[in-house]
């Protein structure tokens, strides 16, 4: 029940985390002017990932989208590459993990087949949530950066006659909703990791007792109940449970088929 | 088509007090930037205030911050301006004017007339 | 405060002759974000209201003629009349859009020479 309820859980915060990603990734305001300490202008800038826009208080807003690809920043190219990796891996890590989960039945999926499905869906949910919180770093870093260039050389004017003011960009929203939805990602990730570990079957050990008759020899293998609630008398790699007597005369070990460390 | 129709102008006595009314039609209020533009009698054009589109935040000129205040009731399509305070050197007409791109403004009321004297 | 300052403080010029204006901000109003200048031209006729003729320094207003144009960029704008027609006489005003206060030039008066 706990394995189910820290998978379930793991999955939803982990569709929260990349719902978050994909906002931040769409948003505008990964970058607004910065208002502190500056003249009041009429217009507001702030920068996206895919376009720049200027709000004026007219209640004009006009947005540019970034036409060229190659005269773009290299660090805003690194950012935006992050964020899709990050993106197209939390996509398919949500892909696998729905078919992971314990409550969803489909077919005669193995439990040990759901946990390696977990793990994989849990590394690619820790994956999408470190390329986020990256790619959100690395433009905060950047916005820092130039934040205290511009800052050096705020008024750059003629002789001091004529000031021109230099625009500064502060951190803008899309900043934090990608640091939170990286975050809560790479927790769901870690969830769905501990979850694999409960769902993982142990190493098994099938008792066979051997009755000695007269004349010949019939090893007996008691039958026992299965685990899984699905139909059928098929027991193969189910794990049963001992249900008859042993004796230390022969005793046969079969290990599961698949052994998790 | 977008109308303003400025009200409320008329004589006061130095200290007094004055509302100035704008109605606006033909365009959703709300979404647009509104101004208050002064003239002097035989002098040039002076900005007065300015409420934004969407925040509605305020802006005002040294001369009358702390005087003046503007205001919109977007539900009755409105803008007002309340002068307080009033000195001689607010005699002029008063226009109410809307703003749209690059904060320029478009549509103007045709005006209505402050007389500040005792 | 931003100081418009406008010249010549009037003008008259010849029907179909080309009149120009000039106007001079104390600081740029060139915005970086959108490399758009927030310079606006306006014409007033005596007795009414200014009408808008140019905004971010070089836009028409729909149903301004052709024959006005704007220009320059930073803290240096124009205003062009390339054929002067009798109905152009007015005063002339800029204003700044991008700095509050929003301050307007003193205005240029032109008249028919």
């Known amino acids: 029940m706990a394995v189910t309820a820290c998978q379930g859980l793991g999955f939803v915060v982990s569709l929260i985390g990349i719902a978050g990603i994909i906002a931040a990734t769409c948003m505008d305001q990964w970058s607004t002017q910065d208002l502190y300490n500056n003249p009041v202008t009429a217009v507001f800038n702030y920068q996206g990932l895919w376009r720049s826009c200027v709000r004026e208080s007219s209640g004009f807003t006009e947005c540019r989208g970034y036409f060229t690809l190659l005269g773009l920043p290299a660090m805003l190219q690194a950012v935006r590459a992050l964020m899709i990796v990050g993106i197209v891996l939390g996509a398919i890590g949500l892909l696998v993990s729905i078919f992971a989960l314990k409550c969803i039945r489909i077919g005669s999926m193995e439990d040990s087949a759901k946990a390696n499905m977990t793990l994989t869906s849990g590394i690619m949910f820790i994956v999408s949530g470190l390329c986020a919180i990256a790619g959100v770093s690395v433009f905060a870093n950047m916005l820092v950066t130039n934040f205290w260039m511009s800052t050096a050389n705020m008024y750059t004017g003629m002789g001091g006659m004529v000031q021109t003011v230099q625009t500064r960009y502060t951190f803008g929203a899309a900043l934090f909703v990608g640091w939170v939805a990286g975050g809560l990602t790479l927790i769901g990730g870690v969830m769905m990791c501990i979850a694999c570990r409960g769902l993982a079957p142990e190493e098994t050990n099938y008792k066979a007792v051997s009755y000695h008759a007269s004349g010949h020899s019939v090893a007996y293998k008691p039958g026992g109940f299965k685990a899984s609630t699905g139909f059928g008398s098929n027991t193969k790699n189910k794990k049963i449970y001992d249900g008859g007597a042993r004796t230390e005369d022969e005793v046969q070990s079969y290990p599961s088929k698949h052994d998790y460390v | 088509e977008v109308q303003l129709v400025e009200s409320g102008g008329g004589l006061v006595k130095p200290g007094g007090s004055l509302r100035l009314s704008c109605a606006a039609s033909?365009?959703?209020?709300?979404?647009?930037?509104m101004s208050w533009v002064r003239q002097a009698p035989g002098k040039g054009l002076e900005w007065v205030s300015t409420?934004?589109?969407?925040?509605?935040?305020?802006y005002y000129p040294d001369s009358v911050r702390g005087r003046f205040t503007i205001s919109r009731d977007n539900a009755k399509n409105s803008l007002y301006l309340q002068m307080n305070s009033l000195r001689a050197e607010d005699t002029a007409v008063y226009y109410c004017?809307?703003?749209?791109?690059?904060?320029?403004?478009?549509?103007w009321g045709q005006g209505t007339l402050v007389t500040v004297s005792s | 405060d931003i100081v418009m300052t406008q010249s010549p403080d009037s003008l008259a010029v010849s029907l179909g002759e080309r009149a120009t204006i000039n106007c001079k901000s104390s600081?740029?109003?060139?915005?970086?974000?959108?490399?758009?200048?927030?310079l606006t031209w306006y014409q007033q006729k005596p007795g009414q209201p200014p009408k808008l003729l140019i905004y971010w320094a070089s836009t028409r207003e729909s149903g301004v003629p052709d024959r006005f144009s704007g220009s320059g960029s930073g803290t240096d704008f124009t205003l062009t009349i390339s054929s002067l027609q009798a109905e152009d006489v007015a005063v002339y005003y800029c204003q700044n859009n991008y700095f509050y206060p929003f301050t307007f030039g003193q205005g240029t008066k032109l008249e028919i020479k």
């Open positions: 600081q740029s109003l060139l915005n970086s974000g959108n490399q758009r200048n927030y």
């Open positions: 004017a809307r703003s749209y791109n690059g904060n320029s403004l478009p549509y």
């Open positions: 033909g365009f959703t209020f709300s979404s647009y930037g």
């Open positions: 409420i934004s589109g969407g925040d509605s935040y305020t």
